[in-house]
């Protein structure tokens, strides 16, 4: 662990109450193939415990979705991954809209610091799938 | 190699016979930019040779595809990556549908064990592109 | 740095003149969350300084885009990442079309050599978003 190989792969636990766009995550071998090795969960949000550059990746699939589900909505459903606390470091890291599709997936490299909490905000009125092969979120420490 | 840096990037060889949804992969410098360094191919399917957490990634593009070719299907074309053997460890790791699009691409972290064979199942009646910059599949060992 | 942990994450600077499909990138902490640690920029194009296998990733979002923007174009908007110099090593590594969507995102493992310059060509008449959470391009050295 001293090498700094912090890594986590999370599965969706639940969505927030109506005015809270955040997705709430869970992880651990008892739940399936999700795990936390270094980072930790704080009320369903991922908190970083080691400074460094991380590869952040996410896939979110909308539940019982067809291309008409997403295209008929006036305000497109959007997923944003960002640092939500501490407030001084708040920033959007990754943003995608679903448009005619039902799944978004992306990844990026970004510097993160100990104590950064990552939030994944799903705006719109469609629900994310809780299937563990359709919706997941992870980070991997790659270098100091 | 003793560091456990197992890694592979594969290109599409061919699809299976009609009732076999699996994609068959190939790799090696003679074929282009694909390679196998640690993992191996067993009849076109990728077999893991070292325990650990892996980053699995895939991109599949449908052949001569326009948005009309996929939207007219009421059975959407779907790509699933999973462990298909040993049977005791069979599970779907990653699943995406094409919906109105012609390409899916995603990645995830997952624990894999020596002997796990990964299958990539493309269900539907569209062919995957064999262009090496449009369709590829790879794994990267990232930590024990 | 002697470990060979070359890594870069870039944000879009600008597009080229009309007959130049290349995207021009920039990186550095002063610009936001982009950085170059090993690779370098040559007139907005990313140049590799260390041989090895790299994970290349990209996300490009089209500016002020809706699914009708992309679907109404006869020639689909396409993004290709490739080695553009030296000419002897020129090859397309990664290619995606937008079709009905407004964002493409993918990643792949590929061998790169010192001196390889990577170009990202966006063909079509739609402009990429310059928002740093919507359009980015990066590489990560993963093994020799």
């Amino acid at each position: 662990e001293s090498l700094g190989w912090d890594i986590a792969e999370l599965q969706l636990n639940h969505t927030g109450p109506q005015q809270d766009p955040r997705l709430y995550w869970q992880g651990g071998p008892a739940l399936g193939r999700s795990f936390l090795r270094g980072p930790e969960l704080d009320k369903g949000q991922l908190r970083i415990r080691r400074d460094g550059i991380y590869m952040v990746h996410i896939q979110v699939t909308l539940a019982i979705c067809s291309s008409t589900s997403t295209s008929r909505h006036h305000h497109p459903t959007t997923l944003a991954v960002g640092i939500c606390s501490p407030a001084s470091r708040s920033i959007s890291l990754l943003r995608l809209s679903f448009h005619q599709g039902c799944t978004i997936a992306s990844q990026r490299l970004t510097p993160l610091a100990r104590g950064d909490t990552l939030c994944t905000n799903l705006t719109g009125t469609l629900l994310p799938s809780r299937n563990t092969d359709e919706t997941f979120f992870g980070v991997q420490w790659v270098r100091p | 190699e003793s560091l456990g840096w197992d890694i592979a990037e594969l290109q599409l060889n061919h699809t299976g016979p009609q009732q076999d949804p699996r994609l068959y992969w190939q790799g090696g410098p003679a074929l282009g930019r694909s390679f196998l360094r640690g993992p191996e191919l067993d009849k076109g399917q990728l077999r893991i040779r070292r325990d650990g957490i892996y980053m699995v990634h895939i991109q599949v593009t449908l052949a001569i595809c326009s948005s009309t070719s996929t939207s007219r299907h009421h059975h959407p074309t779907t790509l699933a990556v999973g462990i298909c053997s040993p049977a005791s460890r069979s599970i779907s790791l990653l699943r995406l549908s094409f919906h109105q699009g012609c390409t899916i691409a995603s990645q995830r972290l997952t624990p894999l064990a020596r002997g796990d064979t990964l299958c990539t199942n493309l269900t539907g009646t569209l062919l995957p592109s064999r262009n090496t910059d449009e369709t590829f599949f790879g794994v990267q060992w990232v930590r024990p | 740095e002697s470990l060979g942990w070359d890594i870069a994450e870039l944000q879009l600077n600008h597009t080229g003149p009309q007959q130049d499909p290349r995207l021009y990138w920039q990186g550095g902490p002063a610009l936001g969350r982009s950085f170059l640690r090993g690779p370098e920029l040559d007139k907005g194009q990313l140049r590799i300084r260390r041989d090895g296998i790299y994970m290349v990733h990209i996300q490009v979002t089209l500016a002020i885009c809706s699914s009708t923007s992309t679907s109404r174009h006869h020639h689909p908007t396409t993004l290709a990442v490739g080695i553009c110099s030296p000419a002897s090593r020129s090859i397309s590594l990664l290619r995606l079309s937008f079709h009905q969507g407004c964002t493409i995102a993918s990643q792949r493992l590929t061998p790169l050599a010192r001196g390889d310059t990577l170009c990202t060509n966006l063909t079509g008449t739609l402009l990429p978003s310059r928002n740093t959470d919507e359009t980015f391009f990066g590489v990560q050295w993963v093994r020799p």
Partner: antibody, heavy 120, light 111 residues
Framework: EVQLQQSGPELVKPGASVKMSCKAS????????IHWVKQKPGQGLEWIGY????????KYNEKFKGKATLTSDKSSSTAYMELSSLTSEDSAVYYC?????????????WGQGTLVTVSA | DIVLTQSPASLAVSLGQRATISCRAS??????????IHWYQQKPRQAPKLLIY???NLESGVPARFSGSGSGTDFTLNIHPVEEEDAATYYC?????????FGGGTKLEIK
Amino acid sequence: EVQLQQSGPELVKPGASVKMSCKASGYTFTDYVIHWVKQKPGQGLEWIGYLHPYNDDTKYNEKFKGKATLTSDKSSSTAYMELSSLTSEDSAVYYCARRGYYDYAWFADWGQGTLVTVSA
Amino acid sequence: DIVLTQSPASLAVSLGQRATISCRASKSVSASGYTWIHWYQQKPRQAPKLLIYLASNLESGVPARFSGSGSGTDFTLNIHPVEEEDAATYYCQHSRELPPTFGGGTKLEIK
């Protein structure tokens, strides 16, 4: 066994219209696109267009836009082609055809053809 | 539209010999790693029958004496050894884009 059974021959006057049918059996009708192909006597084959019975999605060869109209009736697993404003150039055998396993425009199963003769 | 030109227009081949039919496309019909050319056999007063798809794949139930080859713009259908029942007109067809088009046909006669 897949079968495409086409309606019988038609003798029609110039300027009139004709509607021919193609009844499918041996498979799920809404799963497969139906294509239509024209063959003039002693000549080659010309693609007219296709219809997907699931959602009535159609595509036409530019040459046949305004000439051919493709429709279907899911309840009877039947595809139809109507030809309008007929001239002697429309005298031909018209085939319906089903794609093969893969959803691209090559044709694994064919009807027996409907002969249309346009004559005053 | 892509134009397919077949040659020869007709040929006569002795029983047991090889028949070679050519098809040339006005532009490449290769894309996505496949060659989008297909071959059909048509006998008088019958519908066409698919023999070969994607340039070289034998359709189920078609005898192995039929084979297809080629890429880009030049394609060949070979029949060897030719049998009596192979007397027919043969057509190539592309599905690279819409509209699919057919070659003009090659009439094979058995000597």
